[in-house]
Interface confidence: medium
Amino acid sequence: MMTGTIETTGNISAEKGGSIILQCHLSSTTAQVTQVNWEQQDQLLAICNADLGWHISPSFKDRVAPGPGLGLTLQSLTVNDTGEYFCIYHTYPDGTYTGRIFLEVLESSVAEHGARFQIP
């Protein structure tokens, strides 16, 4: 039975050209996290695997940085980065947990800052 829950940064916004941290946290389970996938629509941004370590998708390697922790830092944001992001936790023995984050990248120099995981 899957008892865990994923807490995410939820809906967040950031300025064009800036950086943002995508962060998820799995709680309420003793399951072992074997891999975390970070995905955007149909593209894999990165994986963090207990054995393989971090691996950043080549098309994102210039502006995606691993961490902090199991999170992911997106840099040099563009308006095209607006959209849904998923953290997919592969765990044993529970199975797969998925969290959703919606990122809005704003042209304005006054972006709403509400997420506690955000880079100032």
Epitope: D42, H55, E84, F86, I88, H90, T96, T98, R100
Partner: antibody
């Protein structure tokens, strides 16, 4: 263009070891993970494991732990798989394949395969 | 480990006919969070490495003819070839890439009469 060039066929004695190589070209070797897959004559495909050439981290199918050892040499852009304590069950074609990123772990670039025959 | 079961093990059809083959997984390959099925189909011709046809259960890989269609969700998947051509002679494998170890079905061998 992307190429994975595998070493030639091997005829080896039972109880010995063999090392199969997979030389990558046409892309940055550390950008993609390398998978290894086994195919016995006239049989299906078995996933052996994966290596992250950037970190050297490995993940194995439990079935092949102790049988296969995956390594990578960044300087020559070559991945290796060593098979030990060979028996007739190890007679097979072994493929290396490069990870593919469409939000998934797939293998669109494959080596041509290396036939390993174990015979006294 | 996730077990992938393919059927039939072989089939023989005439050129131009429609063919369907099945793949069933022992666990769901659907990630309910992002609504993706982590299921791929490969084609392997004699003496060649496998070639990726379909990923995400239904998305054709670039360059794959549109006569190849993948469908299904969860644990039941189908590969359909709408009008079989002589060059489609091959073994077709489904693959779980939902969780390690990645596992393949035993294959469906397609013969063209």
């Amino acid at each position: 263009q992307v190429q994975l060039q595998q070493s030639g066929a091997e005829l080896v004695r039972p109880g010995t070891s063999v090392k199969v190589s997979c030389k990558a070209s046409g892309y940055d070797f550390t950008d993609y993970l390398i998978e290894w897959v086994k195919q016995r004559p006239g049989q299906g495909l078995e996933w052996i494991g994966v290596i992250n050439p950037g970190s050297g981290g490995t993940k194995y199918n439990e079935k092949f732990k102790g049988k296969a050892t995956l390594t990578a040499d960044k300087s020559s852009s070559t991945a290796y798989m060593q098979l030990s304590s060979l028996t007739s069950d190890d007679s097979a074609v072994y493929f290396c394949a490069r990870y593919h990123y469409y939000g998934s772990n797939l293998f669109p670039y494959w080596g041509q395969g290396t036939l390993v025959t174990v015979s006294a | 480990d996730i077990v992938m079961t393919q059927s039939p093990s072989s089939l023989s059809v005439s050129a131009g006919e429609k063919v369907t083959m099945s793949c069933k997984s022992s666990q769901s390959l659907l990630n309910s969070g992002n609504q993706k099925n982590y299921l791929a189909w490969y084609q392997q011709k004699p003496g060649q490495p496998p070639k990726l046809l379909i990923y995400g259960a239904s998305t054709r890989e670039s360059g794959v003819p549109d006569r190849f269609t993948g469908s299904g969700s969860g644990t039941d998947f189908t590969l359909t070839i709408s009008s079989v051509q002589a060059e489609d002679l091959a073994v077709y494998y489904c693959q779980n890439y939902h969780s390690y170890p990645f596992t393949f079905g035993s294959g469906t061998k397609l013969e063209v009469k």
